[in-house]
């Protein structure tokens, strides 16, 4: 008779989670010489230790501290790109603009990107059937707490001009409930960060509106200004052309507005 297992509302742990984390760790440390010293087995042990045998609705940032310590990484603090609801374009951008970094370009972000994981209280098993959903079950679940922890640290490390890519196709271009809106915005350090520059990415080819005037962008500006950080905003009307011009800035068509 199978043992009773808690049924959560979200999808279960990603298939082959342990192997995936280790494979990614090996690949990352090979590609990034500055992280060659990292022991991937220890990273996995620390990752596992953060959630195994713990109730998946009772995870704390403290649980992830051993992993955070092992994954400590210095990225140029003035080359940070945050994003909200537009991950793919942000990642395409940093793949071309190699001196800029999203959270997923760091070891810990790279390890966990697009993965789901959770355990069960008092057993060493990983739950591949279901994991807590942030809305329907609980917010202090392993995945949410992980991203909250690494996002906070990433924002805290930022300095000078910080860029954020926002999705202009969404009803809330800036969403206070997103990780960017609820964590990163509030953890930028005013004594280090001079300006937050938002890039609003347009979806429609014929969309010529100035989305920097959107009420949610004004709300973001207000939050940032109250934190004594300057705010600027740019419309990216043609994301395809924008990426092309990052690749080939000397192209004659790249002098006009993108």
């Amino acid at each position: 008779v199978p043992r009773w297992r808690q049924q959560w509302s979200g999808p279960g742990t990603t298939k082959r989670f342990p192997e995936t984390v280790l494979a990614r760790c090996v690949k990352y440390t090979e590609i990034h010489p500055e992280m060659r010293h990292v022991d991937c087995q220890s990273v996995w042990d620390a990752f596992k230790g953060a959630f195994i045998s713990k109730h998946p609705c009772n995870i704390t940032e403290e649980d992830y501290q051993p992993l955070m310590k092992l994954g400590t990484q210095t990225v140029p603090c003035n080359k940070i790109l945050l994003w909200s609801r537009i991950k793919d374009l942000a990642h395409q951008f940093t793949q071309v603009q190699r001196d800029m970094f999203t959270l997923e370009d760091t070891l810990l972000g790279y390890l966990a990107d697009d993965l789901t994981w959770c355990g069960e209280f008092n057993t060493s098993k990983i739950n591949y059937q279901s994991c807590p959903d942030w809305r329907k079950d609980c917010s202090n679940n392993p995945v949410s707490v992980f991203w909250k922890t690494v996002s906070r640290r990433f924002a805290e490390a930022a300095c000078d001009v910080v860029h954020v890519m926002l999705n202009g196709s969404r009803s809330k271009i800036f969403d206070k409930n997103s990780t960017f809106g609820s964590v990163e915005v509030h953890n930028l350090q005013p004594e280090k960060v001079q300006t937050l520059e938002a890039w609003v990415i347009h979806g429609g080819r014929e969309d010529s509106r100035d989305l920097c005037q959107d009420p949610t962008i004004k709300e973001l500006e207000s939050i940032i200004s109250k934190r004594n950080i300057q705010f600027s905003c740019k419309n990216i009307y043609r994301p395809d052309k924008f990426l092309q011009c990052v690749k080939n800035p000397e192209d004659s068509s790249c002098t006009s507005e993108i």
Epitope: K15, R16, F17, P18, E19, T20, L22, A23, R24, V26, K27, T29, D39, C40, Q41, W44, I126, Y128
Partner: antibody, heavy 116, light 108 residues
């Protein structure tokens, strides 16, 4: 305790196909991926292919590309390795193995003999 | 692809002697992902060492592994007649997983 139990020996004619099964117990195929390794008489161990969690797909050693298909049935926790267009040099013991990055566990092996 | 080269191809020693088998990689291998196997005719490969130096469950203490980077070795401190077999090193840090060509250990 992790166990991998493979199907029995097969004798095939050149040009035929063979499908070897590997039933796992003590864990599920959701947790770890299966790799296949063969050893021909008097030869060394040769990795044939296996699941790459980095890319989320099965990858094959160049030598076996297009001639081997590795599949799995997670409902029965059984992995399969099918090889087509068999030649006499495919005579070997075929092993399923699991536990990449951890402790490797091996099936008992399946002898496939290709002979006319 | 990481190529593993084992030496010697054949090693012939007497019981009680010390055997040292070498495995050299074409590029650096993360130690945690280097293993050693013992293979006897008709039997599945037996994992002896993983992580370059950790003995697998049930493996006698006379077997030990060492090395890092591109140079690894397996040592059998005092040979027993039952150690007659072919020994393979394996790396699994990168796909394709690769094996050395093997060292045949003969007991005189």
């Amino acid at each position: 305790q992790v166990q991998l139990v493979q199907s029995g020996a097969e004798v095939k004619k050149p040009g035929a196909s063979v499908k070897v099964s590997c039933k796992v117990s003590g864990y599920t195929l959701t947790e770890f991926s299966i790799h296949w390794v063969r050893q021909a008489p008097g030869q060394g161990l040769e990795w044939m292919g296996g699941f790459d969690p980095e890319d989320g797909e099965t990858i094959y050693a160049q030598k076996f590309q297009g001639r081997v298909i590795m599949t799995e049935d997670t409902s029965t926790d059984t992995a399969y390795m099918e090889m087509n267009s068999l030649r006499s040099e495919d005579t070997a013991i075929y092993y399923c193995t699991t536990g990449r990055f951890f402790d490797w566990f091996w099936g008992q092996g399946t002898l496939v003999t290709v002979s006319s | 692809e990481i190529i593993l080269t084992q030496s010697p191809a054949i090693l012939s020693l007497s019981p009680g002697e010390r055997a040292t088998l070498s495995c050299r990689a074409s590029q650096s291998v993360i130690s945690r992902f280097l293993s050693w196997y013992q293979v006897k005719p008709g039997l599945a490969p037996r994992l002896l060492i993983y992580g370059a130096s950790t003995r697998a469950t049930g493996i006698p203490v006379r077997f030990s592994g060492s090395g890092s980077g591109t140079d690894f070795s397996l040592t059998i401190s005092s040979l027993q007649p039952e150690d007659c077999a072919v020994y393979y090193c394996q790396q699994d840090s990168n796909l394709p997983i690769t094996f050395g060509q093997g060292t045949r250990l003969e007991i005189k």
